[in-house]
């Protein structure tokens, strides 16, 4: 698992739609994979957290004056689409296919 | 000053390009503004910072194990260019007018 | 070594017209703004007209002494600069120097041609 | 069109004593933070040499005796120890916007 120590990744996040109260309007799935971006943006920044000038920028400054600055920060950079079935305002299951930005693709420092 | 208490929020930040070792082949500016994204992201999360669905989601999720989800993260949404002179191949001072992705425009929570 | 050579200027009679060439070597010509500069016996310097990049669609910009009677051109396959000078005046007497460089700055100078307008 | 104005016209000065010249534009010529100004020095029938860029940065193989000041509209190039060689018509120039301008020159001589 991606903790404090390790660098900035995907790692799994299930979601359930009852636990977010979201269940009253999501008919289903119950559940789904969000994913979480987690872990540290350390330098030097790889490739593969497909850095920003300014996230690199950042990291420099908090190398220099880590108490001034923060470290840039793992977060999504790419989202995925899921398909959800939910009611619509006259209470008719309806379903979407792309209920877009709900899932990561993507994780990077920002 | 945006603190850990408060909002997401777009602060100061002034980069000193010798204190990042860029001054090697940024001739000027000396120093530019590039801002930095501070503060948390709380519940609920205001429009102001633009959360995406799946930010909205890992908040909800943080709120009932706060202890297994992190919370969304503050981080550049958009970024502006600065101008920057630096010496080409042959050493010829040469401006660069966009120098993309430098600065922060705005931060929301990710 | 970055070198710009003018060709020989000369004696003209006012209202004639003149072509100024300038032959780069030691550097990547196609990639640097192009310059004429020019000098009055005696006097300052004075930008007369420069022309970008290929990226730049070739913009020209002249001083307002010389627009609609001078036209600068250059061709990148011969790393060459042109200067096509109309409608002469004698106030266009000068050393006319060649110079490449950035949007920021003249970085190389030819050793300048002198061009005379007399009658 | 920026006016660039240069004093003195002509300079006289000791071997081994310090130089300064004098460069005003008529407007700013600072923008995102660097100075469009440039000193070259022009030797009898030679064409002009970039000296300093961007107001304070040496060019290429200048010797360390040449320094350049300024900010804004107000500019300033110093020779801290005059040698025979630097006999020469002295050039401020802006880059800020087109036409690019020359000041009128200072001429240096040896006192």
């Known amino acids: 698992s991606a903790g404090a120590g390790s660098h900035c990744q995907k790692t799994s996040l299930r979601v359930n739609f009852e636990d977010i109260g979201w269940d009253s309007w999501i008919i289903a799935p119950k559940e789904y994979e969000a994913y979480e971006c987690k872990g540290g943006c350390f330098f030097p920044l790889a490739d593969d957290v497909t850095p920003t000038k300014h996230a690199i920028v950042q990291t420099l400054v908090h190398l220099k004056f880590p108490t001034k600055v923060g470290k840039a920060c793992c977060v999504p950079t790419k989202l995925s689409p899921i398909s959800v079935l939910y009611k619509d305002d006259m209470g008719v299951p309806t379903l979407k296919y792309h209920y877009e930005g709900m899932s990561v693709a993507e994780c990077g420092c920002r | 000053s945006a603190g850990a208490g408060s909002h997401c929020q777009k602060t100061s930040l002034r980069v000193n390009f010798e204190d990042i070792g860029w001054d090697s082949w940024i001739i000027a500016p000396k120093e530019y503004e590039a801002y930095e994204c501070k503060g948390g992201c709380f519940f609920p999360l205001a429009d102001d910072v633009t959360p995406t669905k799946h930010a909205i989601v890992q908040t909800l999720v943080h709120l009932k194990f706060p202890t297994k989800v992190g919370k969304a993260c503050c981080v550049p949404t958009k970024l502006s260019p600065i101008s920057v002179l630096y010496k080409d191949d042959m050493g010829v001072p040469t401006l660069k007018y966009h120098y993309e992705g430098m600065s922060v425009a705005e931060c929301g929570c990710r | 070594e970055v070198q710009l050579v003018e060709s020989r200027g000369g004696l003209v009679q006012p209202g004639g017209s003149m072509r100024l060439s300038c032959a780069a070597s030691g550097f990547t010509f196609s990639n640097y703004w192009m310059n004429w500069v020019r000098q009055a016996p005696g006097k300052g310097l004075e930008w007369v007209a420069h022309?970008?990049?290929?990226?730049?669609?070739?913009?020209?910009h002249y001083a307002e002494s010389v627009r609609g009677r001078f036209t600068i051109s250059r061709d990148d396959s011969k790393s060459s600069l042109y200067l096509q000078m109309n409608s002469l005046k004698t106030e266009d007497t000068g050393v006319y120097y060649c110079?490449?460089?950035?949007?920021?700055?003249?970085?190389?100078w030819g050793q300048g041609t002198l061009v005379t307008v007399s009658s | 069109d920026i006016v660039m104005t240069q004093s003195p016209d002509s300079l006289a000065v000791s071997l081994g004593e310090r130089a300064t010249i004098n460069c005003r534009a008529s407007?700013?010529?600072?923008?995102?933070?660097?100075?469009?100004m440039n000193w070259f020095q022009q030797k009898p029938g030679q064409p002009p040499k970039l000296l300093i860029y961007?107001?304070?940065n040496q060019g290429s193989g200048v010797p360390d005796r040449f320094s350049g000041s300024g900010s804004g509209t107000d500019f300033t190039l110093t020779i801290s120890s005059l040698q025979a060689e630097d006999v020469a018509v002295y050039f401020c120039q802006q880059s800020k916007e087109v036409p690019w301008t020359f000041g009128q020159g200072t001429k240096l001589e040896i006192k």
């Open positions: 022309i970008r990049l290929k990226s730049d669609n070739y913009a020209t």
């Open positions: 110079t490449g460089g950035s949007n920021y700055v003249f970085a190389f």
């Open positions: 407007e700013s010529v600072d923008n995102y933070g660097i100075s469009f």
């Open positions: 961007a107001a304070s």
